[in-house]
């Protein structure tokens, strides 16, 4: 008789990434008998929740349930019913909620309470909703990309099965850009991590890793833009802000109350003689770059070297995966290719920012104007952050790999978070076993 496959023995996990600008739900799947193997967990679904981040629901918490419904119901469809009760669900909130908590711990708790109540209504094994720290966000992003790239596997291969694989066990650094924060995480070369807050020690699959990480709150792309506007309006002579980070001909009215709503602009807050001002784009990359640099305080460093704002940063080492908004923005600008030098990226940004707004709108007719209008700023901000903030150079630029997915799984902190919480990354290398014989009878 012919061998026939047994029903697959798989497990699932769900992680919700409650970011500052939106929430995404990820569903992961893995073979049950290979939980401790490296690289076996993969993403089977991403569901982007329609609407803004959960922190925006602070005055309408009773709507959080309906906001999450479509994606939670999607999870119910994707995961077989027999697996529902044993499928863990985790929600991690990032910098948007960190900012809300800074303003009011009570309001942040209220949002999380309603989130927990909503998620508890589903047939899954809900494990809690919490605000993860910036350090965790950096660490889990680093774990995710190295897990997916096979860097924790002790088996060396003569062939490459994943992109960017260099067949050595040197880990990749992780560069994550969100709306409200940005993280840099990597293993420095024989370098003491001079500030304990930035040091992580892991033992993964029998190997020790001393990892540097830092999360810069308020330096995600959206909050960086609010900071820049708040800084620039201080010196505007009237309610017109001629802004080099927006295309020539672009106009937009901004409410001062919106500008000062975030804790990120507190340091620039002042009494203005108007309630609204108008941004008028002038589209000049160089001037935009200069304006962004003023957000980075590089005049003070209590360590051997710093990134900015007095934060220790060891010398950069090895290759880096740049994901989340680093990838989305550069992908839109068509600048993710490994062949594009930093000089070429700068050149392309100069041209892009100088293009008239009417021309841009025609060229990208399908893109929402709010997003479209901010790519000049975001692209320029990414260059400024990587070059002046983190000290990448024209030479080391080629070590940055803009990554959206690896092996079909999104690069980001969620996979690493689930691997950790489900104890799927052992400290010690599992004993190698012969090929499983349980698949066929």
């Amino acid at each position: 008789t012919q061998n026939k496959a047994l029903p697959e023995n798989v497990k699932y996990g769900i992680v919700l990434d409650a970011g500052s600008s939106h929430t995404s739900l990820y569903i992961y799947k893995w073979p049950a008998e290979k939980e401790n193997d490296t690289g076996v967990v993969h993403q089977v679904e991403e569901c982007r929740v329609k609407g803004p981040g959960i922190s925006k629901f602070v005055q309408k918490v009773n709507e959080i349930g309906i906001y999450l419904t479509d994606c939670m119901e999607r999870a119910r469809e994707v995961i077989p019913r027999s697996q529902h009760q044993e499928t863990p669900v985790y929600l991690g909130a990032t910098a948007g909620m960190r900012l809300l908590r800074m303003e009011s711990e009570e309001l942040a708790d209220r949002v999380l309470d309603v989130v927990e109540r909503s998620l508890s209504n589903y047939p899954f094994d809900f494990q809690g909703a919490r605000i993860i720290t910036g350090q965790e966000e950096g660490a889990y992003g680093w774990i995710t990309i190295n897990y997916l790239l096979g860097k924790f596997s002790q088996k060396t291969r003569w062939f490459s099965i994943v992109p960017y694989e260099t067949n050595n066990q040197e880990t990749f650094g992780a560069l994550d850009l969100g709306g409200a924060s940005t993280q840099v995480t990597f293993v420095p070369q024989n370098q003491t991590i001079e500030s304990p807050d930035n040091a992580l020690q892991f033992r993964l699959y029998g190997k020790d890793y001393n990892v540097y990480t830092h999360s810069f709150l308020c330096y995600g792309k959206d909050q960086a833009l609010w900071q820049k506007l708040a800084k620039d309006i201080q010196v505007a002579s009237n309610e017109i802000l001629r802004d080099p980070c927006f295309h020539p001909g672009y106009k937009k009215v901004v409410n001062v109350s919106d500008l000062y709503k975030t804790p990120c602009t507190k340091r620039f807050e002042m009494t203005l003689p108007f309630q609204q001002f108008e941004i008028q784009g002038i589209g000049n990359y160089q001037q935009c770059h200069q304006s962004i640099l003023e957000l980075f305080n590089t005049s003070y460093c209590p360590y051997s070297q710093c990134a900015f704002n007095g934060i220790f940063l060891p010398p950069l080492q090895g290759d880096f995966g740049a994901f989340s908004a680093f990838y989305f923005v550069m992908k839109f600008l068509n600048l993710t290719s490994e062949k594009v030098s930093q000089e070429k990226v700068t050149e392309m940004m100069k041209k892009f920012c100088a293009q008239p707004w009417e021309e841009i709108k025609t060229s990208y007719a399908g893109v929402k104007e709010k997003y479209l209008s901010e790519y000049c700023f975001s692209g320029t901000y990414i260059l400024s952050l990587l070059l002046q903030g983190y000290h990448f150079t024209a030479d080391s630029w080629e070590h940055i790999h803009f990554i959206g997915k690896i092996q079909g799984s999104d690069a980001g902190w969620t996979l690493g978070y689930m691997l950790n919480l489900t104890n799927m990354i052992p400290a010690e290398q599992p004993l190698s076993t012969p090929l499983s014989h349980s698949t066929y009878v």
Epitope: G51, G53, T69
Partner: nanobody
């Protein structure tokens, strides 16, 4: 613009049922969420039940198991079937159609349309 017209309210005894209807007209392709809010005298307006464009639903704890929201896309109408009514369900019931903004600035809702309301009174 979207116009919403409620019907089906009235006076009913405890334990009985009512079915509210909300007919939508106008530019409704921009709407993902529809729902029913209610407001009793001296109270804030509260969300009772909501339904998404995909037909998924959500209910306030106080009405779970008693009320059912449904949507007939062909007729552009949303219904609220209210069973086992209680005196505390007495309120003006408003139909609401909305969609959320994706942006971190400005209001939470990009579109927000309301009906005039229909009175539901549950007598003991």
């Amino acid at each position: 613009q979207v116009q919403l017209q409620e019907s089906g309210g009235g006076l009913v005894q405890t334990g009985r049922s009512l079915r509210l209807s909300c007919a939508a007209s106008g530019d409704i392709f921009s709407i993902n969420y529809m729902g029913w809010y209610r407001q009793a005298p001296g109270n804030e307006r509260e969300l009772v039940a909501a339904i998404t464009g995909r037909g998924n639903t959500n209910y306030a704890d106080s009405v779970k198991g008693r009320f059912t929201i449904s949507r007939d896309n062909a007729k552009n109408t949303v219904y609220l079937q209210m069973n086992s009514l209680k005196p505390e369900d007495t309120a003006v019931y408003y139909c609401n159609a909305w969609d959320y903004s994706d942006y971190d600035e400005g209001p939470l809702r990009e579109y927000d349309y309301w009906g005039q309301g229909t009175q539901v009174t549950v007598s003991s």
